[in-house]
């Protein structure tokens, strides 16, 4: 199982839930669905309120139980590190896989923190980010932002993604805007 | 009590195709995940494959993955294991079992010229 | 591919305890409370013994009980009777083959 680590603005928009928590328990593999179950300890809610409706609390992650069919390993033992997940709802369940951003809070950068936040929201409905793969690439429409990080280093690692989100400029257009100048 | 009866299995040749079954009685079957496992003759035991109580997840060891496909017909109480592009290395005795508690008594395959 | 390791064979008088051991990694035995334990008789299918590390399934005898420390899972049969004598393997779930067994112990009651 293969996949592009995405901006965290396009992870961010395109999760059902996007919480922060704690793995606090043994891994589990549910002898009916073959799904491997984490138990979780959310510590904030920043997306999935209406979703989840008044079920807000979430006990558990779900993932496949087989790396090949993109099942997510948590590899970190540390019960009190805190984490970034966005994942799916499915049957009122938090999905996630290998493709899901999951990711130690304390190794997101400020502006990150501020994406998810209170940003990041901003630019779900009318702005894109658009990953740039290969030269030349052209912006498809003016609500696209082009996300060139993975020319020049790791995805994740990018000047984009740690510090810039795509919001809305003006109707119709979006640009990358910082998210350093935002933090008051 | 659970039960389960393998059948299918018989002399094919290499690059030949089969299609293993097992017919599960005494428990929910739907409830329950499904694996085959395998047992070259004198050698230890391989797991080959598994699927969800649903039939909508399913894995594969690498030594199979692309060659065989397991299914389930929730409506029958059968498993099924469809082996394609065989190998001599496939030779085995074929078990099923309900994730891993009750086995059958095998099904013995064999690849040869 | 032989994913566990377990030795190869392993033997004791009747009366005595046996123990088999099934060593792993932080992937399989060490990462998760899925190691279970299978008796088999010649020309006859696997057994379950133990489950879960330590559970044993309605029927099978006190004698057996199993345990875990580290990545090394084991299995200790006690009061060693003559219809112990047969193979036997251990079995983790593993996150990247899904489920892996040991090569197997032949157990003899001399």
């Known amino acids: 199982c293969t996949c592009v680590p995405p901006h965290p603005q396009t992870a961010f928009c395109n999760s059902d839930l996007v919480i922060r928590a704690k793995f606090v328990g043994t891994p589990e593999v549910n002898q009916t669905t073959l799904y491997q179950r984490y138990e979780i300890k959310m510590t904030k809610m920043y997306k999935g309120f209406q979703a989840l409706g008044d079920a807000a609390d979430i006990r558990f992650v779900y993932t496949p139980a087989m790396e090949s069919v993109c099942g997510y390993f948590h590899r970190s033992h540390n019960r009190s590190e805190e984490f970034l997940i966005a994942g799916k709802l499915q049957d009122g369940l938090l999905h996630i896989t290998t493709c899901s951003f999951v990711a130690p809070w304390n190794s997101l950068s400020l502006a990150q923190r501020r994406g998810f936040t209170k940003t990041y929201t901003v630019g779900c409905e009318e702005c894109t980010v658009f990953p740039c793969l290969s030269i030349p690439c052209k912006l498809q429409s003016g609500t696209h932002c082009l996300w060139t990080d993975q020319l020049l280093q790791g995805s994740e690692k990018g000047f984009q993604s740690r510090h810039l989100a795509c919001l809305p400029r003006e109707p119709g257009l979006c640009t990358w805007q910082s998210l350093r100048s935002q933090i008051a | 009590q659970v039960q389960l009866v393998e059948s299918g299995g018989g002399l094919v040749q290499p690059g030949g195709s089969l299609r293993l079954s097992c017919a599960a009685s005494?428990?929910?079957?739907?409830?329950?995940?499904m694996s085959w496992v395998r047992q070259a003759p004198g050698k230890g035991l391989e797991w080959v494959s598994a699927?969800?109580?649903?039939?909508?997840?399913?894995y594969y060891a690498d030594s199979v993955k692309g060659r065989f496909t397991i299914s389930r017909d929730n409506s029958k109480n059968t498993l099924y294991l469809q082996m394609n592009s065989l190998r001599a290395e496939d030779t085995a005795v074929y078990y099923c079992?309900?994730?891993?508690?009750?086995w059958g008594q095998g099904t013995l395959v064999t690849v040869s010229s | 591919d032989i994913a566990l390791t377990q030795p190869a064979s392993v033997s004791g008088s009747p009366g005595q305890s046996i123990t088999i051991s099934c060593t792993g990694t932080?992937?399989?035995?060490?990462?998760?409370?899925?190691v279970s334990w299978y008796q088999q008789h010649p020309g006859k299918a696997p057994k379950l013994m133990i489950y879960?590390?330590?559970n044993r399934p309605s029927g099978v005898s006190n004698r057996f009980s199993g345990s875990k420390s580290g990545n090394t899972a084991s299995l200790t049969i006690s009061g060693l009777q003559a219809e112990d004598e047969a193979d036997y393997y251990c079995?983790?779930?593993?996150?990247?083959?899904?489920?892996?067994f040991g090569g197997g112990t032949k157990l003899t009651v001399l």
């Open positions: 079992a309900r994730f891993f508690d009750y």
């Open positions: 005494g428990f929910t079957f739907s409830s329950y995940a």
């Open positions: 699927i969800s109580g649903s039939g909508g997840s399913t």
């Open positions: 932080s992937s399989d035995v060490g990462g998760y409370n899925y």
């Open positions: 879960d590390v330590s």
């Open positions: 079995q983790s779930y593993d996150f990247r083959r899904f489920s892996v």
